[in-house]
Structure formats: structure tokens, C-alpha cells
Amino acid sequence: DAEQKACPPGKEPYKVDEDLIFYQNWELEACVDGTMLARQMDLVNEIPFTYEQLSIFKHKLDKTYPQGYPESLIQQLGHFFRYVSPEDIHQWNVTSPDTVKTLLKVSKGQKMNAQAIALVACYLRGGGQLDEDMVKALGDIPLSYLCDFSPQDLHSVPSSVMWLVGPQDLDKCSQRHLGLLYQKACSAFQNVSGLEYFEKIKTFLGGASVKDLRALSQHNVSMDIATFKRLQVDSLVGLSVAEVQKLLGPNIVDLKTEEDKSPVRDWLFRQHQKDLDRLGLGLQGGIPNGYLVLDFNVREAFS
């Protein structure tokens, strides 16, 4: 076993240099010291070590810093960042935006989205701010990474970043994330008016409350069915037929094709059939006429 072998006499290196390229793997395991590697990380990146040798160096560094690499080393990682896993990164404490931007440059075009996202999350956890420069440094990575951040990390994301989010970016977001992002989007777009406001905010409407949707229905927005389907069920079921009619405008006809799918189906179940009939779309599934709906969600008021 490589771990058990002793370093041969005269083979102990005092600096990182090209001689190490010619060491057998077991010699690197036996002879190289993690603290020396950490001190001379720039040289590790300059010399053409094999990937196997680099993975031995990583093993050495991991043993030297079991609690995660110190920021002084992280700043020097350069191309070595490519050999670090997202799990490693989660142990780090990164406070310098320059460190983040440098490492994001290294990861660009390297199939390293997971590492890049973990790095930014780690920076946010340390109280850093995700500015637009950093989002640009994240480059082509879809902003769906916002959904990977913890809700606490999301608080650190400035509202201005919401301008860069596209509809597909939020597909995998939890309800809690959508709620937080919606609040940020409202604040980002507060000075935008009319239809332009709706165009921007509609990406985030999955986080909107019933109150917000009611307000929106007063503005002739003609919401398309795709956006409607992304609304959270809890908010949607609180809207009346008249309010949904105002919200969708001419797109109300598209409800028919979605009547057996959530969230449209859930909304239909909560409406009186007579109100649905007035739409003239042949929508079924409403509360039959003459039935009384008891909402057990308010029973606490009587206990």
C-alpha cells in the first residue's frame, strides 16, 4: 500500500519543482508535504503534473486541511480549482469577491457548473453579496442556481439580479424560494410601469400571493395560460371566476384544454359550477349548484 511506504533517502522535496513530475505515485504519497503544496500552489499550476499526480496532491491538501482549505490557499488555487468537488467547496469560508471571480474565470467552459454554484453559495453564506459582476462571471450558467441556494443565501442576492432571470430558470424552485424571489422581483421592478412591469414580473408569479394576483387582475394583463399554470395552487384557489376572467382576458378560453390538470383542476373544484357555466367554455368540475362549501381551514376560530 502506497501509504505505508517510506520516502526514499534524498527524495524529500523542499520545494515544488519539475523534478516531482518524475516521481512515482507512491513516492509522491510518501514524500510530499501538504503545507509545502499549499505554500507553492502557483508552481503546482505551472508544472505539467498528470491528473493522477494532481489527485495525489489534492489528497495531501485534504489531509492537511480536513476542515476545509483556508482562504489564503483558496485564493491561490488557480487551475487546481478544477480538481475540487462541490462537497469540498461547501466546507470553505470565502469572503473575498475577487477570489470568487478569479475561480469563476478558471471554471468557465469546463463543465464545472456545480463547483461554481457551490463557490458562490459559500461566499453568500459568509455574508458576501452576489453582484451583477459576479452573475456575469457565472456566465452561461442558467440562473436556476438561485434555486440551489439556501433561503438564507437568497436574502443576500441583490434585487437587481432579478433583471437577468428568465422563465426556465425558476422551474425547479421550491415554493419558499419562489416566494422570496417574487419579493425581490417586486422591489427590482417597482419603477417599471404597465405592461412592461407585467412582462418582467410574470416569471416570478409562482411566488405571488392571492392578494397580489387580485391586484394584478385589475390591470388588464391578459396573462397567458403557461404563466397561469405556474401560479401556486394555494394562491390560485382563492381567486373567483370573475377575477380569473379579468386576469386571463381573452386567454380564458385556454382553461378548457387544462381543465383536468393541476392547478386549473384544483381551481375548478373550488368554484361554483354556475359561475363556471357563465363563462360558456363547458368547464366541468365545479361545486354543484345548491351545495354549501364548508372551509375547515378556519375551524381554529371556533376552538
Epitope: 505539467p48 498528470t50 491528473y51 478544477r82 467552459g109 469546463q110 463543465k111
Partner: nanobody, 116 residues
Framework: QVQLVESGGGVVQAGGSLTLSCAAS????????MRWYRQAPGTERDLVAV??????YYADAVKGRFTISRDNSKNTLYLQMNSLRAEDTAVYYC???????????WGQGTLVTVSS
């Protein structure tokens, strides 16, 4: 993927010369470093020489006798071996690694026999 094919091995007298070639094909644009290794019977595979950009590196045993070079237009790596000795007898392997995928590629090896 990168494919590597070595050629040029054979039997040579001690003190003679030989040039090994390694033709690379496939995703050659992504190659980071190229190397020659050798393995004598019953021993570990040893690194002989490396070319990385315009820098070259040699094992002590071959310094001053072997020269590694690369012709990018032909996607070919060379190892010019002069003043050959009996202890240079081995199977010589060409190796390349690529950027991004962090993968290693090997040729099938070519046998060099130095007779004294």
C-alpha cells in the same frame, strides 16, 4: 476522445539513434500535455519526457540524449533518442491528457531493443 498510435520502435545497436513517433487524432485541440513513458520488463512504468506548451522536461536518465518535440500541424509527437544504451530497452508509450475532461489517453506502445 483522443487516439494515439506510436511507431518507430525496433532493434538498434548501443550508441545508435532512433526516433519514435506518436500520431494523435480525435479531439487533439483539447490536449494539454504530451509525454513519453517507458516500461522495462518487471519494472514500473517510468516517465521519460514531457512537452507542455513550449516547455520540455526530461528524466535524469535521458537528459542530454533524448529530445521530445511536437509538430502541431501534423498532430504528431516525437522522441529523438541518441547514444542509446542497453538500459534504454523497454516498451515506450505515448500519453496525452486533455483540458476540461481531465482525462488521460495512452497509445498501445512500441518496443525499443538496444543490443550491446
Amino acid at each position: 476522445q483522443v487516439q494515439l498510435v506510436e511507431s518507430g520502435g525496433g532493434v538498434v545497436q548501443a550508441g545508435g539513434s532512433l526516433t519514435l513517433s506518436c500520431a494523435a487524432s480525435g479531439s487533439t485541440f483539447s490536449i494539454r500535455a504530451m509525454r513519453w513513458y517507458r516500461q522495462a520488463p518487471g519494472t514500473e512504468r517510468d516517465l521519460v519526457a514531457v512537452i507542455y506548451g513550449s516547455s520540455t522536461y526530461y528524466a535524469d536518465a535521458v537528459k542530454g540524449r533524448f529530445t521530445i518535440s511536437r509538430d502541431n500541424s501534423k498532430n504528431t509527437l516525437y522522441l529523438q533518442m541518441n547514444s542509446l544504451r542497453a538500459e534504454d530497452t523497454a516498451v515506450y508509450y505515448c500519453n496525452a491528457d486533455t483540458i476540461g475532461t481531465a482525462r488521460d489517453y495512452w497509445g498501445q506502445g512500441t518496443l525499443v531493443t538496444v543490443s550491446s
